[in-house]
Interface confidence: low
């Protein structure tokens, strides 16, 4: 017989199956091109001196063999004498150590037994009712398949699963979805309903993130407010990287976790846009305002839990940067302008009250006046800062007010609202003899002293009712007592105290009359 043909003679060894545990198994036969076929098998046991014969019986009952020698794979053409269009039965007989070992038989129609491809190209992954659904386009001319998957996590070996029979242009598989770990999947296919058809190779890895993206474990720090009124938000700790199974390490398409930074500027609520979402890699500059910052992790299945921080407002104040003039028509603030065409946000809130009670006003874009100042005015009727109490004022500026990350702090300071001159008048002025020619004048702290940096000084005025001479004594804003000396006994004096701010002279307290009694010697 020719080696390329199936030999229709008795094989050159006795026909007896030893029934041993070793021997040929897993015979697979399939068409590999339009006119060529291949059969392959496994051999278990010592391979030295083993000869393999591929046996074939036609539907007519005639049988033949191919001698494969020591090889466990054999190719033949459709001209080899084996009927490829009709059903044939194939098995392998291995002659070893003077005995014959037989494989289980496979019965198939060779022409229709095709070597299947694994899923090729894109495998679309989605989540369906808590399970993973994979979908792909059936390879050309390969409709009708049995599909298996195998999957592993970073800490577990491969586990096998079954996708069931498929008979459409699109194939799909439902697989387990892990809550908190990434998985690597591979798929393989074989011809449906064809006994002895062999499995395809495994597909390329499909990398699937956990159902829940990892919670971002990051820490932020905020730098000091710079000269430009901005401070950098920096990431102290990078988000933990998702541990990946072996085949997903490197590029790992599909397991990407994206971290987004969501900024919410709490100050200046009257601005157009309060929140902004950024890539975590792009750490923004912030104004001195208060912010809530959230880091949101998401993967292809959607967002996960977020981590939220509060960044408190920078409370460093500039006591002299703001000028306030109060006129009959209303109040005007002046401060050093930042640049041309700036929008300013002026925010104020009563000191000691919840930050949620802040009020603000947005100016139209304005250029500096000839003195380089920016201004904001309001009328008494508007009620702005109209109550006689201490307000904390912050002014923010931006050339692009619609961009949350481009605001800067111009200044923060305190202001006493309403009629500060009158409201600040010191009360409970009392005079006590100190010595033969001096007295001690005390008063209760002015309301202005509750407003840091607002009270510039107290002035104590002493008037000699005889000579009408007046003397004035400046007193540090932290003091509420002064000693008046050089006084004459028996003379009537009046004393008054006022509290001054940097821009306003206070109103004198009610005159307090006193005199030093004449000491009579015995």
């Amino acid at each position: 017989c020719r080696t390329s043909e199936c030999c229709f003679q008795d094989p050159p060894y006795p026909d007896a199956d030893s029934g041993s545990a070793s021997g040929p198994r897993d015979l697979r036969c399939y068409r590999i091109s339009s006119d060529r076929y291949e059969c392959s098998w496994q051999y278990e046991g010592p391979t030295a001196g083993v000869s393999h014969f591929l046996r074939c019986c036609l539907s007519s009952g005639r049988c033949c063999y191919f001698a494969a020698g020591s090889a466990t794979r054999l190719q033949f053409s459709d001209q080899a004498g084996v009927s490829v269009l009709y059903t044939v039965t194939l098995w392998v007989e291995s002659w070893a150590r003077n005995q014959t070992e037989k494989s289980p038989e496979v019965t198939l129609q060779l022409y229709n037994s095709v070597k299947y491809e694994p899923p090729l190209g894109d495998i679309k992954v989605s989540k369906l009712a808590g399970q993973l659904r994979m979908e792909w386009e059936t390879p050309d001319n390969q409709v009708g398949a049995e599909v298996q998957f195998r999957h592993r996590t970073p800490s577990s070996p491969w586990k096998l699963g079954d996708c069931g029979p498929q008979d459409d242009d699109t194939e799909s598989c439902l697989c387990p979805l892990e809550m908190n770990v990434a998985q690597e999947f591979q798929l393989r296919r074989r011809q449906l309903g064809s006994q002895g058809s062999s499995w395809s190779k495994w597909s390329s890895p499909v990398c699937v993130p956990p159902e829940n993206p990892p919670q971002p474990q990051v820490r932020f720090s905020v730098e000091q407010l710079g000269q430009d009124g901005r401070r950098r938000l920096t990431l102290k700790e990078q988000p933990t990287q998702l541990e990946l199974p072996e085949g997903c390490q490197g590029l790992a398409p599909g397991t990407e976790v994206t971290y987004r930074l969501q900024l919410h500027m709490l100050s200046c609520p009257c601005k157009a846009k309060a929140t902004r979402t950024l890539h975590l890699g792009k750490m923004p500059y912030l104004s001195g305002a208060a912010y809530n910052v959230a880091v949101i992790s998401s993967n292809q299945f959607g967002p996960g839990l977020n981590q939220t921080w509060h960044i408190p407002a920078d409370t460093h104040t500039e006591p002299v940067a703001l000028n306030i003039s109060v006129g009959t028509n209303g109040t005007t603030m002046y401060w050093p302008a930042r640049a041309q065409s700036m929008t300013y946000c002026i925010e104020w809130q009563p000191v000691g009250q919840d930050g949620g009670l802040a009020t603000c006003s947005l100016t139209a874009p304005q250029d500096p006046d000839p003195a380089g100042m920016a201004t904001y005015s309001w009328s008494r009727e508007s009620g702005a800062m109209g109550q006689e109490k201490c307000y904390y004022i912050t002014i923010f500026a931006s050339a692009h007010p619609e961009k949350l990350t481009l605001w800067s702090t111009v200044l923060s300071t305190y202001h006493f609202g309403g009629n500060a001159s009158a409201a600040g008048t010191p009360h409970h002025v009392s005079v006590k003899n100190h010595s033969l020619d001096s007295v001690s004048v005390d008063w209760a702290p002015s309301l202005l002293s509750t407003c840091p940096g607002v009270l510039k000084e107290y002035v104590v005025r002493c008037r000699d009712e005889d000579s009408k001479q007046v003397s004035e004594h400046p007193v540090q804003p932290t003091e509420t007592q002064v000693t008046l000396s050089g006084l004459r006994a028996g003379v009537a004096y009046t004393v008054q105290v006022r509290a001054d701010t940097a821009w306003l002279r206070g109103v004198w307290s009610q005159p307090q009359r006193f005199s030093i009694e004449v000491q009579v010697s015995d």
């Epitope: 679309k124 987004r260 950024l278 890539h279």
Partner: antibody
Framework: QVQLVQSGAEVKKPGASVRVSCKAS????????IHWVRQAPGQGLEWMGI????????SYAQKFQGRVTMTRDTSTTTVYMELSSLRSEDTAVYYC???????????WGQGTMVTVSS | SSELTQDPAVSVALGQTVRITCQGD??????AGWYQQKPGQAPVLVIY???NRPSGIPDRFSGSSSEDTASLTITGAQAEDEADYYC???????????FGGGTKLTVLG
């Protein structure tokens, strides 16, 4: 291989409509968005709109709202773009493009020249 | 809706490094895509995502981004790199997309 093949050049009168086709092959048609982008002679690229071939949902640039319609036929893996009430400034090369996960256009059609002239 | 701003023209000496920039509000939230277009041809994607190059794009092309600016860098520019370069990004306000006006790159010498 992955490709988008567009229909041929068109000459139209002002006020008329034009329909340009874009046939996709070499990938899972329903898995990726298709966009339409145009380029007037000597000008830059201008995004017109997007269609999701899976469900057919669309979103159009403000400028083309009311004049553009994008449709798809999953049986032939073809996307269509129809622009109505044509004016001379609609003279341009019209491209279809497939976008990847990053909304970047990784595959482009060869372009269809549409000339609007009276 | 967002706008992306590019320099209209940039030139570079053969073999030198050139940086083309794209500025816009949406780039604070989304990465840019970069496209090369030669006369009479459809655009070709050269960079997308953080700094991803499609297969077939030489590694002299790279991308980077900062606050609201994306950059395309060509290290060792070649004569065949002379072309128009466009950036694009998702609009920060909706799922629409927007292109920059384009930069004409001239390679000298």
């Amino acid at each position: 291989q992955v490709q988008l093949v567009q229909s041929g050049a068109e000459v139209k009168k002002p006020g008329a409509s034009v329909r340009v086709s874009c046939k996709a092959s070499g990938y899972t048609f329903t898995s990726y968005y298709i966009h339409w982008v145009r380029q007037a002679p000597g000008q830059g690229l201008e995004w017109m709109g997007i269609i999701n071939p899976s469900g057919g949902s669309t979103s159009y640039a403000q400028k083309f709202q009311g004049r553009v319609t994008m449709t798809r036929d999953t049986s032939t893996t073809t996307v269509y773009m129809e622009l109505s009430s044509l004016r001379s400034e609609d003279t341009a090369v019209y491209y279809c493009a497939k976008s990847n996960w990053a909304y970047a256009f990784d595959i482009w059609g060869q372009g269809t020249m549409v000339t609007v002239s009276s | 809706s967002s706008e992306l701003t590019q320099d209209p023209a940039v030139s570079v000496a053969l073999g030198q490094t050139v940086r083309i920039t794209c500025q816009g509000d949406s780039l604070s939230s989304y990465y840019a895509g970069w496209y090369q277009q030669k006369p009479g041809q459809a655009p070709v994607l050269v960079i997308y995502g953080k700094n991803n190059r499609p297969s077939g794009i030489p590694d002299r092309f790279s991308g980077s981004s900062s606050e609201d600016t994306a950059s395309l860098t060509i290290t060792g520019a070649q004569a065949e790199d002379e072309a128009d370069y466009y950036c694009n990004s998702r609009d920060s306000s909706d799922n629409h997309l927007v292109f920059g006006g384009g930069t004409k790159l001239t390679v000298l010498g």
